[in-house]
């Protein structure tokens, strides 16, 4: 039975050329996380594996940094980075939990950041 919930940073905006942290947090479940996948639309950005650690997809190596925690840092943002991002938690025995974040990259020098939450 899937009892868990995923909190995310929600809808966020950032300035072109800047960086942003994408974060998800799985709570309310005793399931064990074995892997977290980060995806942009249908493209795999990175994998954080409980045993093997981080793997960043080669095409994103220059602009994606692992962490903090199970989160992902996107750097040197471009307008093309605007879109949906997904954290996919693989858990035993619950299965997969998916969180959604929408990122808008603004040309303007005044990018309004959505509310951030801190992972305890």
């Amino acid at each position: 039975m899937m009892t868990g919930t995923i909190e995310t940073t929600g809808n966020i905006s950032a300035e072109k050329g800047g960086s942003i942290i994408l974060q998800c947090h799985l709570s309310s479940t005793t399931a064990q996380v074995t892997q977290v996948n980060w995806e942009q639309q249908d493209q795999l950005l990175a994998i954080c594996n409980a045993d093997l650690g981080w793997h960043i997809s080669p095409s994103f190596k220059d602009r994606v940094a692992p962490g903090p925690g199970l989160g992902l840092t996107l750097q040197s943002l471009t307008v093309n980075d605007t879109g949906e991002y997904f954290c996919i938690y693989h858990t035993y025995p619950d299965g997969t939990y998916t969180g959604r974040i929408f990122l808008e990259v603004l040309e303007s020098s005044v990018a309004e950041h959505g509310a951030r939450f801190q992972i305890p």
């Epitope: 399931a31 064990q32 996380v33 892997q35 093997l52």
Partner: antibody, heavy 122, light 106 residues
């Protein structure tokens, strides 16, 4: 080599307690969930539940609550099964089994202990 | 709980035979199914996971297929060391095992 080594056979009287150990080696113990499986003589496999090796949180299958306790000592990469108030019907082989695979598509019990025979008899 | 029904419970076959074992789930489990082989006095051994993926080191005469509620394990040419009991297991939710299929020498 990845392996799970369990403690030896036990002969116990009804009402007594037993603690079975399962020592892991060759992999990162806290990265893989651990399960316990019972097999009564001449019977099939019965999933007893599992323990989150990262948090120590146990989950028990129906019929295995109350007298059964799963625990860990991560410092020695060992999982434990304790059964209290033993009954004749607890006579069985008890296995520990690791969940292998990283994504949900790959989950399966890929490494098993050799089994511990627990006999309950007066 | 999801129930798994294996058939047949017993199967008599000869070396070289093609053997098929069926596992039916009481509700859809996608491809979250594994097959194990168990010999007397030994622990079960993983043969196949994700319904059709062969575990490393397992001979290619073993194959699995199916999704949803119906699954099969096939041994293309039975070898002397294949006489054993076979179990299916679902991992769609809390794991459960099928009742087992004992493959005996004819």
């Amino acid at each position: 080599e990845i392996q799970l080594v369990q403690s030896g056979s036990e002969l116990k009287k009804p009402g007594a307690s037993v603690k079975v150990s399962c020592k892991a080696s060759g992999y990162t113990f806290t990265s893989y969930p651990m399960n316990w499986v019972r097999q009564a003589p001449g019977q099939g496999l019965e999933w007893m539940g599992w323990i989150n090796t990262n948090t120590g949180n146990p989950t028990y299958a129906q019929g295995f609550t109350g007298r059964f306790v799963f625990s860990l000592d991560t410092s020695v990469s060992t999982a434990y099964l304790q059964i209290s108030s033993l009954k004749a019907e607890d006579t069985a082989v008890y296995y520990c089994a690791r969940v292998g695979g990283y994504s949900v598509d790959e989950y399966a019990f890929d490494v098993w202990g050799q089994g511990t025979m627990v006999t309950v008899s007066s | 709980a999801i129930r798994l029904t294996q058939s047949p419970s017993f199967l008599s076959a000869s070396v070289g035979d093609r053997v098929t074992i069926t596992c039916r789930a009481s509700q859809g489990i996608s491809s979250y199914l594994a097959w194990y082989q168990q010999k007397p006095g030994k622990a079960p051994k993983l043969l196949i996971y994700a319904a059709s993926t062969l575990q490393s080191g397992v001979p290619s005469r073993f194959s699995g297929s199916g999704s949803g509620t119906e699954f099969t394990l096939t041994i293309s040419s039975l070898q002397p060391e294949d006489f054993a009991t076979y179990y299916c297991q679902q991992l769609n939710s809390y794991p459960t095992f099928g009742g087992g299929t004992k493959v005996e020498i004819k």
